[in-house]
């Protein structure tokens, strides 16, 4: 996990999230996403 400080005085937390592709489709393997401020963006 990474934490970034900004001049505005608030912090944004990054967290890598890993999902299994087969849970949402027919593919195998892992899907890696990034959660920023509580929202998965990738």
């Amino acid at each position: 996990d990474a934490e970034f400080r900004h001049d505005s005085g608030y912090e944004v937390h990054h967290q890598k999230l890993v999902f299994f592709a087969e849970d949402v489709g027919s593919n195998k393997g892992a899907i890696i996403g990034l959660m920023v401020g509580g929202v998965v963006i990738a």
């Epitope: 890993v18 999902f19 299994f20 592709a21 087969e22 849970d23 949402v24 195998k28 892992a30 996403g33």
Partner: nanobody, 124 residues
Framework: EVQLVESGGGLVQAGDSLRLSCTAS????????IGWFCQAPGKEREFVAA????????YYADSAKGRFTISRDNAKNTVYLQMNSLKPEDTAVYAC?????????????????WGQGTQVTVSS
């Protein structure tokens, strides 16, 4: 819901191997992704590895890649963690946990059922 019991821990020498087992009872085993986590004294719980309900997908923490292998036998309702080339820094309590599908598998907050854990101690 599912219940989990771990076994296979113990005291080994550095470089040795262990195979941990996580046996489930209760609900349909294949409905759950299973993860292994470890917690060393005074440290936070860490993700080790996870496997999908079918066994077709796996994911490993960087520290486990190349040394640990997660697998499952759905006929026996059991998930295994084969641990090779063990190091003293692998010493920890290892616990398995079950997560509903579609949740992130590398974070402990996704897991709502936990086993009691099994102690692994690696001496130098």
């Amino acid at each position: 819901e599912v219940q989990l019991v771990e076994s296979g821990g113990g005291l080994v020498q550095a470089g040795d191997s262990l195979r941990l087992s996580c046996t489930a009872s209760g609900r349909t085993f294949t409905d759950y992704n299973i993860g292994w986590f470890c917690q060393a004294p005074g440290k936070e719980r860490e993700f080790v590895a996870a496997i999908s309900g079918s066994g077709g997908s796996t994911y490993y923490a960087d520290s486990a890649k190349g040394r640990f292998t997660i697998s499952r036998d759905n006929a026996k309702n059991t998930v295994y963690l084969q641990m090779n080339s063990l190091k003293p820094e692998d010493t920890a309590v290892y616990a398995c946990a079950a997560a509903q599908r579609r949740l992130a598998v590398n974070v402990d907050t996704s897991y709502n059922v936990w086993g009691q854990g099994t102690q692994v101690t690696v001496s130098s």
